[in-house]
């Protein structure tokens, strides 16, 4: 910035108008002022600038608002929006869901999912609810984004929205936050029965406490193997051999293509091979008989 | 009312410059920027650029950068287009056309200049 | 050069609806006006539609404009023998700084 050369006699601009397209980019960054141009955001976005001046007028927005945008120019961003990356979002403070949902539109087929994202996160940050109207406006943005969000931000996310989430929205979730989605999941699909219930739940399940895993093997629900693979370890080996036959039912057979990896594998070796032998499905890696298991967990507590 | 009133048709050689005028009347002539629009025989338009009659200011395409000169004399209310090096393929009817503040259009143009260069 | 897609050619019979699309990308269309010309044949161009979908006075209400991400499309409904020109779709071009046009449609009135 020591190098930067002053603005030329009679170039100031006094407000945002078509002869700034003429300017040459030195000039913009000596003559442009950033409160100007977050007062007149409106003109910012009519005008055709190039990207490349664009980028000069958000340098300057950036020079005058160090801490982040005041939501009262975030409100006004429109097509700005475009150039303003996750970083910059994660700074702002945003509390209107008006203003959430008109830059979500602005950003619709633009490749802007980590803006839109960042911006939702944001939100929810103040203490916004996540509506389905929102979601609807994140579009054709995969619900992986929930996995973005903090533990304290999925509080906010009402379960209304666990209706729209698809088996591969969760494939990068952490433990925690599929615990705090299935809870929500189940409170989503209370009043569904039966089978119904199990085909919204399943998405969820990586999310399942054993307890929970036991209850739904009471209910004949032929859990499909890739379902069963994406049961979190933990709740996984503390079912037994005849818990998992009732939970995957015709579909047990399956195992067998799985029993070098995890998570069956960490099941099998927690079972007693006579257990799995019961069933003829040739399973090995089990306990084998007339050994004691020690749980190290509970000596430990001990010591 | 509005008009934009262009010199006559030339014809150049290869190598050779042109320069052709675009009179305005009818409004402030520094209020409207004027455009420089071009069209080859039975192709579409291309443009070529822009200038501020009001303090001089152009902005070119890419494509005619270093080859294109606009100019304007405020006293006559005339904007001026000069192109050289002219090779065959810059045959064309040649546009000035104002540009509308606020909607970014060209709401009046000129009748066009045929410009041919032929050896 | 050019940067807008127009189909070469549509046509239509007396009375009848046609539309023409004009096809760009997110540093054009998607992120500015786009306005439409009629070139009559041997006349300069004239203004027919600008701001996407807004029509200047004096041009009637059968030609309609609208737009929608990065394409936009002209209707011309009612059709009749002086509609018969090339049309050009043209927006701003914020990667460059340039005005850009499309190829141009002409439009045959049959019969």
């Known amino acids: 910035d020591a190098e930067q050369k002053a603005c030329p006699p009679g170039k100031e601009p006094y407000k945002v108008d078509e002869d700034l397209i003429f300017y040459q980019n030195w000039e913009l960054e000596a003559c442009v002022d950033g409160t100007m141009l977050a007062r007149q955001m409106d003109l910012v976005n009519e005008i055709p600038f190039t990207y490349e001046q664009l980028s000069i007028f958000k340098h300057k927005l950036d020079k005058t608002y160090p801490q982040g945008y005041p939501e009262s120019l975030i409100q006004q961003l429109g097509h700005f929006f475009r150039y303003v990356s996750p970083e910059d979002i994660h700074q702002w403070n945003v509390t209107s869901p008006d203003t959430v949902k008109t830059l979500l539109k602005v950003s619709k087929g633009q490749k802007m999912n980590a803006q839109a994202i960042a911006l939702v996160a944001c939100y929810l940050r103040g203490g916004g609810q996540l509506d389905e109207d929102m979601v609807k406006a994140l579009g054709d943005i995969p619900l992986s984004y929930l996995c973005d969000f903090s533990p304290q931000d999925l509080h906010s996310v009402p379960s209304s929205v666990m209706w729209l989430v698809g088996p591969q929205d969760l494939d990068k979730c952490s433990q925690r936050h599929l615990g705090l989605l299935y809870q929500k999941a189940c409170s989503a699909f209370q009043n569904v029965s039966g089978l119904e219930y199990f085909e919204k739940i399943k998405t969820f399940l990586g999310g399942a406490s054993v307890k929970d895993l036991r209850a739904l093997s009471q209910h004949n629900v032929s859990m499909d193997i890739a379902t069963f693979k994406r049961l979190q370890v933990d709740s996984l080996v503390g079912l037994s051999v005849a818990e998992v036959q009732k939970l995957l039912g015709p579909n047990i057979v399956d195992l067998k293509t799985e029993e070098d990896k995890s998570p069956v594998r960490d099941w099998l070796f927690r079972q007693h091979q006579k257990d799995l032998d019961r069933l003829g499905l040739g399973l090995q890696g089990g306990i084998p008989n007339g050994y004691l298991v020690l749980d190290f967990n509970v000596r430990e507590a001990f010591s | 009312q509005v008009q934009l009133v262009q010199s006559g048709a030339e014809v150049k050689k290869p190598g050779a410059s042109v320069k052709v005028s675009c009179k305005a009347s009818?409004?402030?002539?520094?209020?409207?920027?004027i455009n420089w629009v071009r069209q080859a025989p039975g192709q579409g338009l291309e443009w070529m650029g822009i200038?501020?009659?009001?303090?001089?200011?152009?902005k070119y395409a890419q494509k005619f950068q270093g080859r294109v000169t606009m100019t304007r004399d405020t006293s006559i209310s005339t904007a001026y287009m000069e192109l050289s090096s002219l090779r065959s393929e810059d045959t064309a009817v040649y546009y000035c056309?104002?540009?509308?503040?606020?909607?970014?259009?060209?709401?009046?143009w000129g009748q066009g200049t045929l410009v041919t260069v032929s050896s | 050069d050019i940067v807008l897609t127009q189909p070469p050619s549509v046509s239509g019979a007396p009375g009848q609806r046609v539309t023409i699309s004009c096809s760009g990308s997110?540093?054009?269309?998607?992120?500015?006006?786009v306005s439409w010309y009629q070139q009559l044949p041997g006349t300069a161009p004239k203004l027919l539609i600008y701001?996407?979908?807004q029509r200047p006075s004096g041009v009637p209400d059968r030609f309609s404009g609208s737009k929608s991400g990065t394409s936009a499309s002209l209707a011309i409904t009612g059709l009749q023998s002086e509609d018969e020109a090339d049309y050009y779709c043209?927006?701003?071009?914020?990667?460059?700084?340039?005005?850009?046009f499309g190829g141009g449609t002409k439009l045959t009135v049959l019969g």
């Open positions: 056309a104002r540009w509308h503040h606020g909607t970014w259009i060209f709401d009046y």
């Open positions: 009818g409004y402030t002539f520094t209020g409207n920027y």
């Open positions: 200038i501020n009659p009001h303090g001089g200011d152009t």
């Open positions: 997110s540093s054009n269309i998607g992120s500015n006006y």
């Open positions: 701001n996407d979908n």
């Open positions: 043209s927006s701003w071009d914020r990667a460059d700084g340039s005005y850009v």
